[in-house]
Interface confidence: low
């Protein structure tokens, strides 16, 4: 139903506090360069405002949509063309062209130093003297590095987190309770941002059916008993929400959430048995709880998938009067037979069972043609089954350090143009894959190994895209976003690449590395290791062992030397020279 | 061989009420949605009501909303449609339908389809 004013519709539903986050992401994820103060301050403008629209819909500006707002606090920022350049530019546009160009302007990888948690007691002091602005600054800085971040989800984190600190800060060992349990907080967020930066890109390149084909498929693994009208249902929800989420709609997304959690509620019956825990919750934790929902119990007396897909003699009539519709019930009845396949894989299928379709319908005898099209799926579900084994098999062997080092050493053979901090993170992220996944049931494996692996070739992709230097990059990037993986997963050693010279203050060392926390140290080796392949594209494995062994063996001694700058100075050399010659 | 059979159609008064049923035989019912369509003399049919195959999801078009209820009982293999506060504008043939797979409830999802029956509202 029409509001007269949008606003004071957004903040009755959302109420202040859910308002303010959100409003403050919003302008964190549009204005990334901006400080927390500068922001806050515009925040409680808008709500101040929003708060007279609440008590008079008929005040003046109050009928303006919110982009409109929004567009127009930004746009009175003073110095924006100084501290943004070009984004200024969007201000002289008109809704909704302005809110487009402020879209197309998010950076993926913002200038900003990385975010330093500070220690523990510190963190505790500032969280007690004033909670609410602490919690901002969390949204605030987690908003403006991932311009993504699905809003309503970020709100849910910042919980987390003020229920960790709560608990925490009470403690004697502030430290000992904080470090786990706001690791596995950031874990759990990093993650959730590069899932929705690809929900993201696949509304963006794709459209919005590529995005309802992903979500059919995810909804029917999870409810398996629900009809495929109301699987339509949930899926056509979803898109919207994330559509408008990602379209930075952010106070309208929440809101349909809040309205999709409930919806859900109210019909567990017709939806899946595993709600109700759930629905018993607040509703942030509600809607989160619903998205990691485990998948419902598939029923016992599921007929095969070929009699109303490959045997029945209507299929090329009932495909040519709906091939949306059809290839949508074709994706729903396979996915709920198939929670132990990954969304991609699922996609992957009603793809080729499309193309199947579309070739043997033209001919003359199409059932004789189609006939063989479940056999022909074997193929395409062994490949990622096979990457899932002997990656995890790897990960086993190597533990997650070697295994993300495997994996730095076969991405930069890979695309050796790429620059050396990007492969370190797409390595360190894909390494994550074993520990996230290879500990699991054998059953949840693919799905969550292939489901994540695309995830975090999408980051690379939208980094890579930003500066094009690897044409195979290009290509796997540029195709559909299900076969992405497959194509990263097929390139080989690229023969074009001229090797990097080396450059022997690539591979000088300070001893600053001996201060470094663990994480950093592990960059600072696997930086060495990416320079060390692009220098040497076919170096052996023992080869690249041999170095890097003796390269740890250094460090570790001037760490422990009296004199850690003079061991650095007169080793270092030493070891370069040992270097070049082991990898000549 | 499939068959579905329409029944309770009638004259009835402006405000009046009606029940059609609608009796399935030669279908697996309950993997079937249901679907009430109706075509007016010089009009092309439109889709009234329809329902999921376990009942639990529902459309109605707004035309119709809040004076028409669709229900089904699939032990009995018939679908219902109660329709209180009839308007002359109701007048039409009403023909129900059987989808094995129903999304958008556009005609083409519909599979098999009664021979209808006439309700007429006068005022």
């Known amino acids: 139903e029409a509001h007269k004013s949008e606003i004071a519709h957004r903040f009755k539903d959302l109420g202040e506090q859910h308002f303010k986050g959100l409003v403050l992401i919003a302008f964190s994820q549009y204005l990334q360069k901006c400080p927390y103060e500068e922001h806050i301050k515009l925040v409680q403008e808008v709500t101040d405002f929003a708060k007279t629209c609440v008590a008079d819909e008929n005040a003046e500006n109050c009928d303006k949509s919110i982009h409109t707002l929004f567009g127009d606090k930004l746009c009175a920022i003073p110095k924006l063309r100084d501290n943004y350049g070009e984004l200024a530019d969007c201000c002289a546009k008109q809704e909704p062209e302005r809110n487009e160009c402020f879209l197309q302007h998010k950076d993926d990888n913002p200038n900003l130093p990385p975010f330093q948690r500070p220690e523990a007691e510190a963190m505790c002091t500032s969280f007690q003297e004033n909670p609410t602005s602490f919690l901002g600054h969390y949204l605030h800085e987690v908003a403006r590095r991932h311009p993504y971040f699905y809003a309503p989800e970020l709100l849910y984190y910042a919980e987390k987190y003020n229920e960790v600190l709560t608990q925490c800060c009470t403690e004697s060992d502030k430290a000992a309770c904080l470090t786990p349990k706001l690791d596995a907080v950031k874990e759990k967020a990093l993650v959730a941002a590069v899932r929705q930066r690809m929900k993201c890109s696949s509304m963006q390149r794709f459209g919005e059916r590529a995005f309802k084909a992903w979500a059919v498929a995810r909804m029917s693994q999870r409810f398996p008993n629900a009809e495929f009208a109301e699987i339509t249902k949930l899926a056509t929800d979803l898109t919207k929400i994330n559509k408008e989420c990602c379209h930075g709609d952010l106070l309208e997304c929440a809101d349909d959430r809040a309205e999709l959690a409930k919806y859900m509620c109210e019909n567990q019956a017709t939806i899946s048995s595993k709600l109700q825990a759930c629905c018993d919750k607040p509703v942030l934790q509600k809607s989160q709880c619903l998205a990691e929902i485990e998948h419902d119990n598939i029923p016992a007396d599921l007929p095969s998938i070929a009699a109303d897909f490959v045997e029945d003699k209507e299929v090329c009539k009932n495909y040519a009067e709906a091939k949306d519709v059809f290839l949508g019930t074709f994706l729903y009845e396979y996915s709920r037979r198939h929670p132990d396949y990954s969304v991609s894989l699922l996609l992957r299928l009603a793809k080729k069972y499309e193309a199947t379709l579309e070739k043997c319908c033209a001919e003359g005898d199409p059932p004789a043609c189609y006939g063989t099209v479940l056999a022909e799926f074997q193929p395409l579900v062994e490949e990622p089954k096979n990457l899932v084994k002997t990656n995890c098999e790897l990960y086993e062997k190597l533990g997650e350090y070697g295994f993300q080092n495997a994996i730095l050493v076969r991405y930069t053979q890979k695309a050796p143009q790429v620059s050396t901090p990007t492969l370190v993170e797409a390595a360190r992220n894909l390494g994550r894959v074993g520990t996230k996944c290879c500990t699991l049931p054998e059953a949840q494996r693919l799905p969550c190994v292939e489901d994540y692996l695309s995830a975090i070739l999408n980051r690379l992709c939208v980094l890579h895209e930003k500066t094009p230097v690897s044409e195979k990059v290009t290509k796997c990037c540029s195709g559909s976003l299900v076969e992405r993986r497959p194509c990263f997963s097929a390139l080989t050693v690229d023969e074009t690449y001229v090797p990097k010279e080396f450059k022997a203050e690539t591979f000088t060392f300070h001893s600053d590395i001996c201060t470094l926390p663990d994480k950093e140290k592990q960059i600072k080796k696997q930086t060495a290791l990416a320079e060390l392949v692009k220098h040497k594209p076919k170096a052996t494995e023992d080869q690249l062992k041999t170095v890097m062994g003796d390269f740890a063996q250094f460090v570790d001694k001037c760490c422990k030397a009296a004199d850690k700058d003079n061991c650095f100075a007169t080793e270092g050399p030493n070891l370069v020279a040992r270097s070049k010659e082991a990898l000549a | 061989e499939v068959q579905l059979v329409e029944s309770g159609g009638g004259l009835v008064q402006a405000g009046g009420s009606l029940r059609l049923s609608c009796a399935a035989s030669?279908?697996?019912?309950?993997?079937?949605?249901m679907g009430w369509f109706r075509q007016a003399p010089g009009k092309e049919r439109e889709r009234v009501v329809s329902?999921?195959?376990?009942?639990?999801?529902?459309y109605y078009a707004d035309s119709v909303k809040g004076r028409f209820t669709i229900s089904r009982d699939n032990a009995e293999n018939t679908v219902y449609l109660q329709m209180n506060s009839l308007k002359p504008e109701d007048t039409a043939v009403y023909y129900c339908?059987?989808?094995?797979?129903?999304?958008?409830?556009?005609?083409?999802?519909?599979?098999?389809w009664g021979q209808g029956t006439l309700v007429t509202v006068s005022s």
């Open positions: 329902i999921s195959r376990g009942g639990g999801y529902t």
């Open positions: 339908a059987a989808a094995r797979y129903w999304a958008t409830g556009s005609e083409y999802e519909f599979d098999y």
């Open positions: 030669g279908l697996t019912f309950s993997s079937y949605a």
